[in-house]
Interface confidence: low
Amino acid sequence: FERTRSLQDPCSNCPAGTFCDNNRNQICSPCPPNSFSSAGGQRTCDICRQCKGVFRTRKECSSTSNAECDCTPGFHCLGAGCSMCEQDCKQGQELTKKGCKDCCFGTFNDQKRGICRPWTNCSLDGKSVLVNGTKERDVVCGPSPADLSPGASSVTPPAPAREPGHSPQ
């Protein structure tokens, strides 16, 4: 049924970048400036996203694809498609409702975004602290005294704590 209907629908012939103009006898008309259609058979074109204020244009709008935004320096993207820009903080800080605040003792943040995370507890792994943590860096765990033997690796740095999540390239 769907196949039959689409064959009978003249709008299905309208490619991306156009819309099916009912006012012009269902002729495929190009999307007007500052609008786009990313799929064929559309009866309207969508308005292009405007990257304004703290947003900066990463990819211009074309007749077939929307504009993409990222954030101006000092800010980073949050949300799908960079729907929000959040203020950067310094390493060793996290963003709170009152602005950027230093990480509390025992926590660190090695990037300009995200939250302060607890230092690795080396003793849980039976290891000792080789290098103390700071606000900006996690501790480095070393071997327990029993592990120290000729040829033994002396430093096992923990995986750096990084926030996952999408950031415009």
Epitope: R58, D70, H76, P160, R162, P164, H166, S167, P168, Q169
Partner: antibody
């Protein structure tokens, strides 16, 4: 330390699809974009595109849209670039390089793979 | 696409010289300009990012300046190990684009 390891050289027959690899180590693979850059002998550098390993989101240079396909294997921290129907024009050195965010620079580069397309 | 032009494709200088390499963008790139060094063996390293910031481990004899569409890389006291090709690259807009490179040789 940060390392992006690439095979030194690859030989492929014209028309035979092939994949170049880039194995990352020394950092959190999913937090940085992997970019691919082409350099023909005696020529400049051309950006092919990039991929964000966390969700495999890609951006391509339109020039390479139909030539290159970027993928990642998070379990092995390896990025791949597949080249479709290679010709002699694709003979070049291909670099993988990482980028943290937005307009930041390509801060670490692989050694490059010399691809030769020849019968 | 933004075109990046390095008008000097090769440059000859003596050890100890002050060398300046220039790069021009086809539109304002708001200081999103990076410089890379490619050694004869193909190894590529980041030198300077965002026009003037030195990447970690890069000797302070390298410096960068510029704004708008015109940018430059300066090596204040040329050393043998600086023999390489230098590329500029804009990080303002996709697709990322590079200059054609300037090959630095010793007189």
């Amino acid at each position: 330390q940060v390392q992006l390891q690439q095979p030194g050289a690859e030989l492929v027959r014209p028309g035979a699809s092939m994949k170049l690899s880039c194995k990352a180590s020394g950092y959190t693979f999913t937090s940085y974009w992997i970019n691919w850059v082409k350099q023909r002998p005696g020529q400049g550098l051309e950006w092919i595109g990039n991929i964000y390993p966390s969700d495999s989101y890609t951006n391509y240079n339109q020039k390479f849209k139909d030539k290159a396909t970027l993928t990642v294997d998070k379990s092995s921290s390896t990025a791949y670039m597949q080249l479709s129907s290679p010709t002699s024009e694709d003979s070049a050195v291909y670099y993988c390089t990482r980028l943290y965010y937005g307009s930041s620079p390509f801060d670490y580069w692989g050694q490059g793979t010399t691809l030769t397309v020849s019968s | 696409d933004i075109q990046m032009t390095q008008t000097t494709s090769s440059l000859s200088a003596s050890l100890g010289d002050r060398v300046t390499i220039s790069c021009r963008a086809s539109q304002d790139i708001s200081n999103y300009l990076n410089w890379y060094q490619q050694k004869p063996d193909g190894t590529v390293k980041l030198l300077i990012y965002h026009t003037s910031r030195l990447h970690s481990g890069v000797p302070p004899r390298f410096s960068g300046s510029g704004s708008g569409t015109n940018y430059s890389l300066t090596i204040s006291n040329l050393e043998q190990e600086d023999i390489a090709t230098y590329f500029c690259q804009q990080g303002h807009t996709l697709p990322r684009t590079f200059g054609g490179g300037t090959k630095l040789e010793i007189k």
